[in-house]
């Protein structure tokens, strides 16, 4: 067969769908690989062909579009399952071609089983809500295009296994779920089940997402350096190990990059010749505020090292701060006999 532009297996689009539910899957060619859409391609006389490779098989085979009740069908650039079955799992290929042009891409489709409490191996999207921030909503995702606007579906919301029925601060409003005041207790998995009729049959669309309540931007502050501080002096003798922790608190900020770094005499540790190691640890609060600790360590400190300036720096979307550590050389204690002798005026 003639050459075809093969975009390979697009593992970035690992599509997961629930067993026994309708699924509509758009050919990724038009979304991510080609600069024109399906209508343009169709008008230009190009044909979209679908085929698949079953799980644990190498053989590409055509998709059977003659199943009872049109269980699998194609409509424009969409492959429809009404509904999916477990053994539909495999790699699907859509190929756009005519006599002079050919382009194709494959993508994995996994049909996933769920239990009656919606537990499954499905990777769940995470929706972050700000704590005590006023009314916030989540929307039942990925249900567009499944039924015409003339069809009025029934939407039921669940938290974990249970229907949301008179929960204190959570109100189902059709496709939306409103949180009047989000609290830590609202953390969890939320599921919307959309029930709709089609051609005398009833279908369900189940969509689960994880809600995580995070720090509010109202309460966000610039980074706070807890250590080093003015109360602690790092007093060392040459040859001892110098350990200085830099501990910084960061308020949760959506999409903010939190950074902590040390400078020694104004330079990054990598840019100087001292034998310095830096170890970092990160911990999070329940609302995803972050505490980062970077411990600067010099195994055998020299008197030169003890004269240097050690500064901890921190930066987030809220601002940048810095704090110098108080480092000094320990004054050796006078010898006891000499001190006594001097004290009594001995010669």
């Amino acid at each position: 067969s003639e050459r075809c532009d093969d975009w390979g297996l697009d593992t970035m689009r690992q599509i997961q769908v629930f067993e026994d539910e309708p699924a509509r899957i758009k050919c990724p060619l038009f979304e991510h690989f080609l600069k024109f859409n399906y209508s343009t391609a169709h008008s230009a006389g190009l044909t979209l062909i679908w085929y698949w490779t079953r799980q644990d098989r190498d053989l590409e085979e055509p998709i059977n579009f003659r199943l009872p009740e049109n269980r699998i069908s194609k409509e424009k650039d969409v492959l429809w399952f009404r509904p999916t079955l477990l053994n539909d799992t495999g790699n699907y290929t859509c190929m756009l071609r005519n006599t002079t042009y050919c382009s194709k891409v494959a993508f994995p489709l996994e049909v996933v089983q769920k239990d009656s409490c919606f537990n499954s191996p499905m990777k769940l999207p995470v929706h972050k809500l700000y704590i005590e921030y006023g009314i916030q909503r989540i929307t039942c995702p990925n249900v567009d295009g499944y039924f015409p606007s003339s069809v009025k579906p029934t939407i039921t919301w669940y938290m974990g296994c249970y229907k949301i029925q008179n929960f204190n601060n959570v109100i189902p409003e059709g496709m939306n779920l409103s949180f009047l005041i989000a609290l830590i207790s609202n953390n969890g998995n939320y599921t919307c089940v959309v029930t709709y009729p089609e051609n005398g049959r009833t279908f369900h669309l189940t969509r689960t997402l994880t809600v995580k309540v995070v720090g509010s931007p109202k309460n966000a502050v610039p980074p706070v350096i807890h250590s080093p501080n003015d109360h602690v002096v790092y007093e060392k003798e040459p040859g001892e190990e110098l350990l200085i922790p830099c501990t910084v608190y960061f308020s949760f900020l959506m999409d903010s990059r939190n950074e902590v770094w040390w400078t020694i005499d104004g330079k990054k540790p990598d840019d100087i010749t001292i034998d310095v190691t830096i170890n970092e640890s990160i911990s999070h609060s329940r609302t995803e505020d972050e505490t980062r600790t970077q411990i600067l360590s010099i195994k055998k400190v020299t008197s030169e090292d003890l004269k240097r300036s050690y500064v901890c720096h921190a930066r987030s979307a809220k601002g940048e701060v810095a704090k110098a550590a108080k480092v000094k050389q320990k004054v050796p204690a006078p010898r006891y006999t000499v001190e006594l002798a001097c004290g009594f005026g001995a010669t």
């Epitope: 249970y162 229907k163 029925q165 008179n166």
Partner: antibody, heavy 120, light 107 residues
Framework: QVQLVESGGGVVQPGRSLRLSCAAS????????MHWVRQAPGKGLEWVAV????????FYADSVKGRFTISRDNSKNTLYLQMNSLRVEDTAVYYC?????????????WGQGTLVTVSS | DIQMTQSPSSLSASVGDRVAITCRAN??????LNWYQQKPGKAPKLLIY???SLQNGVPSRFSGSGSRTDFTLTISSLQPEDFATYYC?????????FGQGTRLEIK
Amino acid sequence: QVQLVESGGGVVQPGRSLRLSCAASGFTFRNYGMHWVRQAPGKGLEWVAVIWYDGSNKFYADSVKGRFTISRDNSKNTLYLQMNSLRVEDTAVYYCAREEGIAVAPFDYWGQGTLVTVSS
Amino acid sequence: DIQMTQSPSSLSASVGDRVAITCRANQSIASYLNWYQQKPGKAPKLLIYGASSLQNGVPSRFSGSGSRTDFTLTISSLQPEDFATYYCQQSYSTEITFGQGTRLEIK
């Protein structure tokens, strides 16, 4: 303990109306969906209607659509079934049932039933 | 509407027997299936929900299996109190439907 007590049944002529009540106790009534199910003498169970916990959604069996109305008063912990244009085939024991608040929606508690007889 | 068909309609068995009642839906209902037991003059009682979960207080001789369109209620060793009528019910659709019932009688 959970209790559901139906009342309002009786003998009525075809074309007339009747209103059934179901008094709930022993649980937070406003947190549950409620159903009516009926059973004609010597026959099987037939689902009649459901009302959601807050009254926002109501669904009916085709056989009663347009004639029966389900409603609830959460302040009185009471479920109702207004039956209009009654037919002989509506003769049955009517049960109210509580729907457990999980996805598969089983009816975990039932009332003892009230008999409705439609006869001329 | 989703139709539920139970078989057999009636069944004669003896104490200690293992019996199975089947229920078939005319379309896939996943595991949205519940089983009830009803004795004469009494309200139905929930036995199994979600096709296979045993309701609290129900003896472990009752079990449920199946998914999609075919479901089974099994009683592993019949006891005298088990002679009753059994109904399956689907809650997949907003319009709920019951099977026509299976009457279990003493042989």
